[in-house]
Interface confidence: low
């Protein structure tokens, strides 16, 4: 499996592009839209029929250092009576995001882009029934 | 994660904070993730709060293709397969980091950008606003 490369050869390179050593790219980590404050609307993680909890993972050698992951609270879904219905399944919904990984090798520091799979929340689905012959 | 102890003789700059601009290897370390959610699972069809997936393409961004979820119904699908409007289908939204070409069209110069995407939908008990 090929590791994807970010640089695209089909772009016409303007004169104003900064010089970049071969095999690498220049990355400004001052985030565009950094101050867009986001909060999920009014605790949907508790109101969902497939509720979830959040945990924060912390890594000082990752940028951003804080990544929030969701975990479904139940295997089944919560019915109208507030009881778990195991004829339905709570399943995680996931989304890829990019992070920058800092690596120390001796006294030198290198940076690597990494795709991270974040579990965002959960949804309630009808299970796939596998009939055993 | 644990910070790797450094040789005491190393200069101590950039230990805690990341520098504003970094040179990064063009290869992305990815965890075998699948960028097409239609291929990776059929939750969008099987959910009690089903959603459609819309392709958002931008060649000035990496990844250039992002899939956006749009809930199909205001209510949720009940056991009979009908829409129950006593419940609400709502999108689950997430901020993700992408790369934006900066300056525009440059092949190997990027800036991180935070974008908000709807990843899927979940079925919730509605908040009832009582009008006085």
């Amino acid at each position: 499996r090929k590791i994807p490369k970010v640089g695209h050869t089909f772009f016409q390179k303007p004169e104003s592009c900064p010089p970049v050593p071969g095999g690498s790219m220049k990355l400004d980590i001052g985030i565009i839209n950094e101050n867009q404050r986001v909060s999920m609307s009014r605790n949907i993680e508790s109101r969902s029929t497939s509720p979830w909890n959040y945990t924060v993972t912390w890594d000082p050698n990752r940028y951003p250092s804080e990544v929030v992951q969701a975990q479904c609270r139940n295997l089944g879904c919560i019915n109208a009576q507030g009881k778990e219905d195991i004829s339905m399944n709570s399943v995680p919904i996931q989304q890829e995001t990019l992070v920058v990984r800092r690596k120390h090798q001796g006294c030198s520091v290198s940076f690597q882009l990494e795709k991270v799979l974040v579990t965002v929340g959960c949804t309630c689905v009808t299970p796939v029934i596998h009939h055993v012959q | 994660g644990i910070t790797i102890p450094r040789n005491p003789g190393c200069p101590n700059s950039e230990d805690k904070n990341f520098p504003r601009t970094v040179m990064v290897n063009l290869n992305i370390h990815n965890r075998n993730t699948n960028t097409n959610p239609k291929r990776s699972s059929d939750y969008y069809n099987r959910s009690t709060s089903p959603w459609n997936l819309h392709r958002n393409e931008d060649p000035e961004r990496y990844p250039s293709v992002i899939w956006e979820a749009k809930c199909r119904h205001l209510g949720c699908i009940n056991a009979d397969g009908n829409v129950d409007y006593h419940m609400n289908s709502v999108p689950i939204q997430q901020e993700i980091l992408v790369l934006r070409r900066e300056p525009p069209h440059c092949p190997n110069s990027f800036r991180l950008e935070k974008i908000l995407v709807s990843v899927g939908c979940t079925c919730v008990t509605p908040i009832v606003h009582h009008v006085a």
Epitope: - | K70, H73, P91, S118
Partner: nanobody
Framework: EVQLVESGGGLVQPGGSQRLSCTAS????????MGWYRQAPGKQRELVAL???????DYADSVKGRFTISRDNSKNTVYLQMNSLRAEDTAVYYC??????????????????WGQGTLVTVSS
């Protein structure tokens, strides 16, 4: 916050037509579905029609072929064109929308919002 304001209600003759409109206002980021519900005296609120951001629409069986829902995304407005009106269409018509919006620097993902309702009376 987000407000939904309906207009266009009133008294109509059986067989006549009426057009309702509903506009969403506030610091709106996206509207992924808008629609109309109605509540006749002594009855439960019921779906009339919904229109999704992609343009596809969903109608209650009782109004199919008579009512048409449309939306103008640039104006955050949804319309309900009601033709061949019957006495049983008499109800308070409520606008509903799923909206994402900013308020006080916080982003709220989509929730169901409701208008105050507009009365449509079909009578000779």
């Amino acid at each position: 916050e987000v407000q939904l304001v309906e207009s266009g209600g009133g008294l109509v003759q059986p067989g006549g037509s009426q057009r309702l409109s509903c506009t969403a206002s506030g610091t709106i980021v996206n509207i992924h579905v808008m629609g109309w519900y109605r509540q006749a005296p002594g009855k439960q609120r019921e779906l009339v029609a919904l229109i999704f951001s992609g343009g596809s629409a969903d109608y209650a069986d009782s109004v199919k072929g008579r009512f048409t829902i449309s939306r103008d995304n640039s104006k955050n407005t949804v319309y309900l064109q009601m033709n061949s009106l019957r006495a049983e269409d008499t109800a308070v018509y409520y606008c509903a929308a799923e909206i994402g919006y900013y308020s006080g620097g916080t982003y709220y993902s989509s929730e169901a919002h409701w208008g105050q309702g507009t009365l449509v009376t079909v009578s000779s």
